[in-house]
């Protein structure tokens, strides 16, 4: 959570002299309450906008907009405090609009905007606009708050922002997964234009359950430049467990910009359709071997094998 460094924010408009200042989120009117305070903001709206930094990077920003109520309290309005709280980390950032001239009623409703709060993909924020001075302790609240959910990097516009591109959002592996037979799964995907390794994480589940019955990890070495953007295929050997038939394949890249924290892509193969009269299963025969505690992935030489090819 930070402020855009360019261009300098502006709050002045026709009929109002105003400047934007950094704020500690604790306006002086908290400490020294005033008798007469303005009413709360009206029609607070927050939208996702995008802005370039001086360096040319593109970031998602919260575009905050609100209007004033058409009452006499605007005569006592000295400014506004804009606060953004990131829900998961409790980090808060504030700015203050400081009015340098008195507001007057005129033919149109006063409207204010601010678009300098840089936000993160897939995060949730509480945006509050507080009119200043803040009310006395038992006074009516003169703020309005709204939640703002930033889309993740799969969102079309977010995909091309700097934070998303850094986490590998432009790579589309176009994964296809095919069951060759009861013991083999073929995975095809498109390599990215970087000489970096990949991992395929296979997790298998019983038909209607969410507890895994088989896990396997397969390492794919870094492709050569001539293999960039080519299809790679891997054949994974499954553990032959009856009913362990729903397979989730996740491909984890290790791009230099995001290392072990890159966006992953996955595909799932459902269990085959069950016949109307299923074969009887002997009583008390477990569907898979129960494993306690650890859910560590098996690596290549442990109960699962695989091989891969790059297609030119």
């Amino acid at each position: 959570l930070r402020l855009l460094d360019f261009p300098a924010p502006v709050c002045a408009q026709e009929g109002l002299s105003c400047r934007v200042k950094n704020s500690t989120c604790l306006d002086d009117s908290w400490i020294h309450p005033r008798n007469l305070t303005p009413s709360s903001p009206k029609d607070l709206q927050i939208q996702l906008h995008f802005a370039h930094t001086q360096q040319g990077d593109l970031f998602p920003v919260a575009h905050i907009e609100w209007t004033l109520q058409t009452d006499a309290s605007i005569l006592y309005l000295e400014g506004a405090e804009l606060s953004v709280l990131q829900l998961n980390t409790n980090e808060r950032l504030c700015v203050r609009f400081e009015f340098l001239s008195k507001l007057r009623h005129h033919h149109r409703r006063w409207r204010f905007t601010f678009s300098h709060f840089v936000v993160d993909p897939d995060q949730e924020y509480e945006v509050t606009v507080h009119h200043l001075p803040k009310p006395i302790p038992d006074g009516d609240p003169n703020h309005q708050s709204k939640n703002f959910l930033v889309p993740d990097c799969e969102h079309a516009r977010m995909k091309v922002t700097t934070p998303c591109m850094s986490s590998g959002s432009l790579w589309d592996p176009n994964i296809t997964v095919e069951t060759l037979d009861t013991q083999h799964l073929r995975v095809d995907f498109t390599l990215w234009n970087e000489s970096t390794h990949y991992q395929i994480l296979l997790t298998s589940f019983p038909h209607m359950e969410n507890h895994s019955c088989f896990e396997h990890m397969h390492h794919i070495p870094a492709p050569r430049p001539e293999e960039f953007h080519q299809r790679s295929n891997v054949t994974l050997t499954l553990r032959n467990l009856k009913g362990c038939c729903r397979h989730q394949v996740q491909i984890q890249p290790f791009f230099s910009s995001c290392l072990n924290d890159c966006l992953r892509h996955s595909a799932t193969v459902s269990c085959p359709e069950m016949p109307d009269t299923p074969e009887p299963i002997p009583d008390y025969m477990p569907l898979w071997e129960p494993r306690s505690g650890s859910s560590d992935y098996k690596d290549d030489d442990d109960k699962g094998s695989s091989h891969h090819h790059h297609h030119h």
């Epitope: 989120c25 604790l26 709280l85 829900l87 998961n88 980390t89 409790n90 980090e91 808060r92 897939d122 995060q123 949730e124 509480e126 509050t128 703020h143 708050s145 709204k146 939640n147 924290d261 890159c262 966006l263 992953r264």
Partner: antibody, heavy 118, light 107 residues
Framework: EVQLVESGGGSVQPGGSLRLSCAAS????????MNWVRQAPGKGLEWVSI????????HYADSVKGRFTISRDNAKNSLYLQMNSLRDEDTAVYYC???????????WGQGTTVTVSS | DIQMTQSPSSLSASVGDRVTITCRAS??????LAWYQQKPGKFPELLIY???TLQSGVPSRFSGSGSGTDFTLTISSLQPEDVATYYC?????????FGPGTKVDIK
């Protein structure tokens, strides 16, 4: 001293209701989101709910959605959890917890015990 | 929803041993991970947040590492007062799920 004190726990029959309270002191309560976390006897921690500083964001664990309601009164420095349609599996120690700036929860209450039993 | 798993579920080690607990998220959570210590009959205490930042007042023998899906809590030299259950918690987005816990005791 930063402090959270829970109250309102007790014994209730399945289907009954309880309202838990958490009194905060020693910090600017209205600046913080707040959480409820519970722990069933002999079990691990389970996150229950969060409410943002101005109550505009509220989330619940799937296990309590539709039955529990989190709320707060910043003027009273208080956090609440209204629990309806209580079940045996809601038996637990309930903690209120304040998030740390940067992540995690750094201030916890001592907990209040809720027992659901017929 | 993202699932959190911890391993081992329990461990016994000698005083002075190096102890490692792992936590895995079923999807990437960046570095939005916290570790807690809970002693019997007490409330949990925050040890580490942002995957590797030591909470103020926590002994330096505790450290955290990892990013994405795989995280580690390490106690460099186990002390008798470290007997407790350790939980990881993800906080990238609600629900802020905890791992099932790892019980640590002294041999």
């Amino acid at each position: 001293e930063v402090q959270l004190v829970e109250s309102g726990g007790g014994s209730v029959q399945p289907g009954g209701s309880l309202r838990l309270s958490c009194a905060a002191s020693g910090f600017t309560f209205s600046s913080y989101s707040m959480n409820w976390v519970r722990q069933a006897p002999g079990k691990g921690l389970e996150w229950v709910s969060i409410i943002s500083s101005r109550s505009s964001i509220i989330h619940y664990a799937d296990s309590v959605k539709g039955r529990f309601t989190i709320s707060r009164d910043n003027a009273k420095n208080s956090l609440y959890l209204q629990m309806n349609s209580l079940r045996d599996e809601d038996t637990a120690v309930y903690y209120c917890a304040r998030p740390k700036v940067g992540g995690g929860m750094d201030v916890w209450g001592q907990g209040t015990t809720v027992t659901v039993s017929s | 929803d993202i699932q959190m798993t911890q391993s081992p579920s329990s461990l016994s080690a000698s005083v002075g041993d190096r102890v490692t607990i792992t936590c895995r998220a079923s999807q990437g959570i960046s570095n939005y991970l916290a570790w807690y210590q809970q002693k019997p009959g007490k409330f949990p205490e925050l040890l580490i947040y942002a995957a590797s930042t030591l909470q103020s007042g926590v002994p330096s023998r505790f450290s955290g590492s990892g990013s994405g899906t795989d995280f580690t809590l390490t106690i460099s030299s186990l002390q008798p007062e470290d007997v407790a259950t350790y939980y990881c918690q993800k906080y990238n987005r609600a629900p802020f799920t905890f791992g099932p816990g790892t019980k640590v005791d002294i041999k």
